[in-house]
Interface confidence: low
């Protein structure tokens, strides 16, 4: 039957469709195609006569139709006015008709839509916002994200005008959140930018910190109060009823007993209109005077200073205490205490060494501490380190390396390659390297305050083919079902795949086995003897690849349990005895004897010439491996019957 | 992030002069090289001149000795190009490259500026 498919059904504006005519029959005359779902000669597109190759525009042939031989109708640059049907019209050689009719839709390519909103500072648990998707279109979907996400489930959220426009009711500061709508229909989809919706609230109920409410007298009182409120609250301070000051920070300093009272935090959000304030009650008590520290070395050196650390001021009668890091002084032959406590010398400081240090003042009711003191040992450089840690490069990157020592003060840092001074900088930078820029880069580090410098020198290599690699080993002789190995391929490069290969296959699917460091690692966990394979690993980038040679893991294994050959326990007087003895095992194990428990030699083959039945027994072969500490043994019956006898018969009487 | 950005080229007529600027950031000329390479249409790219400010030394190709200068003034991270004497084959885009401290390989380049000699 003859059939019209339209390619494709939903047209966008300005494409292009596809008429396409399925079984058309033999022996034409001709064709017409129609706009509309019928024959009607004023909505003739076009006429086509096969016998003269002749196609003939009608009263609807706008000049954007393509008519094929085989029947099939091409319409290009698409309008709004071309949806609906299409009639063919076959006329057959026997001058017999035949009809059929096909469709499609044309729709607009969607402009970008924008998000207008009717409330641009809504005011929460108050106000509801409309968002509105721009422009109006017909025939188009409308959805909306929030945060990319679709939108949650909310009895405070409401979809109106065919989804145009999304209400949000008593909007919450949760609701400070990025929009967009997106419109669709069956030709395009387009997405807004986002509008951020800026919910104005609060200001809640402020909280005042410290939350002690105790101070003693010569202390600082420092308050801070902070409300949760969109736009920031505006605070102000009260003591005692009366207005202090308009700051979110409330300082008096060496405060009094006559500092006493109620300090009230009042946060103001002058958007929203709203008050909060939260009220606070402060004692201070008269107290001794507070300790300080003082100290004899206030930049010692590393390994090389003693510091005296001393409790001021000096009082009679008075206990005084230390604390390291906030604990008790630790016991150690490098803290020495005066015999008044007053003095904590601390012997040849190290780094671990700054503190900080508090000493305190015992009196009747507490402790006074002093304030924390931290001490600023100089020390380093220790050895610097170079990062990243890549010894290979491809040519036209940048180079960028970055040195690192431990030091106080900090170290300055110079650069050098092959021996040449290149910048005092801790980073150095080459941009779009060459094969040229291969060499020995040796980072220095200074100290200035010790004067002590340190080195370190990193091979670079810089080459377009990347270097045969090699593989490394934290373990040349693993211990089979006990160790694991860890094989790694050198060097570490950059923008680099690694790829192992085990007897020449790519790895095989195992728990035992596992990959790590981007591929560079691959390690054998619980190693057995079959694991003694050649290992190879690649190396390859956009340009080159290279193997390296096989590495054959080593693994100790054994030693099994041995086995006695031949097998016969049988034999005839006059006979002579060889017994050789077996065991799987690497390294070769040693091998020992006992005939009836009596030690005999270590070979591996015990040899007695022309037996007899004194020689009847047990014989035991015992097998040890030095190397994975391991012993085995096997125990075989031997009987010898004298000459004339069969083996295994008893003799008759 | 390393930038080098040209100014100072135009329209001048044979005989005349212009002086070409060269602004970096993202690193200090005075650790490095830097040169001017010109590209005209159907020619080699040519390095015309180059400076490395860390041991003062400068180079200049035979087609532009005694007609062009190369300087750099490290305090303003900028290097100079002063052309006297123009000439019609000296028409091109100019480009500032970082030339590098160990071998001299212009290979990092700005966007260019056009320098066009024509009466």
């Known amino acids: 039957k003859l059939t019209i498919e339209s390619t494709p059904f939903n047209v966008a504006e300005g494409k292009e469709v596809l008429l396409l005519v399925h079984n058309l029959p033999q022996h034409l005359f001709g064709y017409s195609w129609y706009k509309g779902e019928r024959v009607d000669g004023n909505r003739q597109i076009i006429g086509y006569v096969i016998g003269t190759q002749q196609a003939t525009p009608g009263p609807a042939y706008s000049g954007r139709e393509i008519i094929y031989p085989n029947a099939s109708l091409l319409i290009q640059n698409i309008i709004q006015n071309d949806t609906g049907f299409y009639t063919l019209h076959v006329i057959k050689s026997d001058l017999v008709n035949e009809e059929a009719t096909g469709q499609f839709r044309v729709y607009p390519e969607l402009p970008k839509p924008s998000i207008s909103s009717n409330n641009s500072k809504p005011v929460e648990d108050k106000d509801a916002v409309a968002f509105t998707c721009e422009p109006e279109t017909q025939d188009a979907t409308y959805l909306w994200w929030v945060n990319n996400q679709s939108l949650p489930v909310s009895p405070r959220l409401q979809l109106s005008n065919g989804n145009r426009t999304l209400t949000l009711f008593n909007v919450t500061r949760n609701d400070t959140a990025s929009y967009k709508c997106e419109t669709q229909n069956p030709v395009s989809a387009r997405r807004s930018d986002s509008v951020i919706l800026n919910v104005l609230y609060g200001p809640d109920a402020p909280t005042i910190s410290p939350l002690n409410t105790s101070y003693r007298s010569g202390e600082n009182l420092n308050l801070s109060c902070h409300a949760a409120s969109n736009p920031p609250a505006q605070y102000s301070w009260f003591v005692n009823g009366t207005f202090q000051q308009s700051t979110q920070e409330l300082f008096i300093p060496n405060i009094t007993v006559n500092n006493s009272g109620s300090y009230t935090c009042q946060a103001h959000n002058s958007d929203t209109g709203l008050n909060r304030t939260t009220v606070t009650t402060i004692t201070v008590y008269a107290e001794p005077p507070k300790p300080f520290i003082t100290s004899n070395n206030s930049n010692p050196v590393e390994d090389e200073d003693a510091v005296a650390l001393t409790c001021e001021p000096e009082i009679q009668n008075t206990t005084y205490l230390w604390w390291v890091n906030n604990q008790s002084l630790p016991v150690s032959p490098r803290l020495q205490l005066s015999n008044d406590n007053r003095t904590l010398t601390l012997l040849s400081v190290t780094r671990n060494d700054v503190g900080p240090y508090e000493c305190g003042i015992q009196n009747e009711l507490s402790v006074d501490h002093s304030d924390p003191v931290i001490l600023n040992v100089l020390y380093g450089p220790d050895d610097p380190t170079i990062s990243p840690s890549y010894t290979y490069y491809r040519p036209g990157v940048n180079l960028s390396l970055s040195c690192h020592a431990a030091s106080n003060p900090p170290a300055q840092y110079s650069w050098l390659i092959d021996g040449n001074i290149q910048q005092h900088t801790q980073e150095l930078f080459i941009s779009n390297i060459t094969e040229k820029n291969s060499g020995l880069y040796t980072c220095q580090a200074n100290n200035s305050a010790s004067g002590h410098s340190r080195t370190t020198v990193k091979t670079i290599t810089v080459s377009a083919e990347l270097p045969k690699p090699s593989i490394s080993s934290n373990n040349s002789k693993p211990v089979e079902d006990k160790d694991a190995v860890a094989f790694t391929c050198e060097p570490e490069a950059q923008n680099t795949t690694y790829l192992w290969w085990v007897n020449g296959q790519s790895l095989p699917v195992s728990p035992r086995l596992q990959l790590s460091n981007g591929n560079r690692t691959l390690t054998l966990f619980n190693v057995t003897r079959n694991d003694a394979r050649a290992y190879v690993c690649g190396i390859q980038n956009s340009v080159s690849a290279n193997r390296s040679d096989p590495v054959t893991l080593d693994v100790l294994y054994g030693p099994d349990t041995p086995i006695i050959s031949p097998p016969d326990s049988s034999y005839l007087s006059g006979a002579n005895l060889n017994l050789s003895c077996h065991s799987a095992s690497n390294p070769s194990p040693q091998y020992s004897w006992r005939i009836n428990g009596i030690p005999q030699q270590h070979t591996q083959v015990l040899f007695i010439a022309k037996i007899t039945p004194n020689n009847n027994g047990t014989y035991a072969c015992f097998v040890s491996n030095l190397a994975t500490g391991r012993n085995n043994s096997i125990v075989k019956s031997i009987t010898v019957s004298a000459s004339g006898t069969s083996p295994g018969l008893s003799a008759g009487a | 992030e390393v930038q080098l950005v040209e100014s100072g080229g135009g329209l001048v007529q044979p005989g005349g002069s212009l002086r070409l600027s060269c602004a970096a950031s993202?690193?200090?000329?005075?650790?490095?090289?830097i040169g001017w390479v010109r590209r005209a249409p159907g020619k080699e790219e040519e390095l015309v001149a180059d400076?490395?400010?860390?041991?003062?030394?400068?180079r200049y190709a035979d087609s532009v000795k005694g007609r062009f200068t190369i300087s750099a003034d490290t305090s303003k991270n900028t290097a100079y190009l002063q052309m006297n004497s123009l000439r019609a084959e000296d028409t091109a885009v100019y480009y500032c490259?970082?030339?590098?401290?160990?071998?001299?390989?212009?290979?990092?380049w700005g966007q260019g500026t056009t320098v066009t000699v024509s009466s």
């Open positions: 400076i490395c400010p860390y041991k003062g030394s400068t």
């Open positions: 993202g690193f200090n000329i005075k650790d490095t090289c």
């Open positions: 490259a970082i030339v590098s401290a160990r071998d001299g390989y212009y290979n990092y």
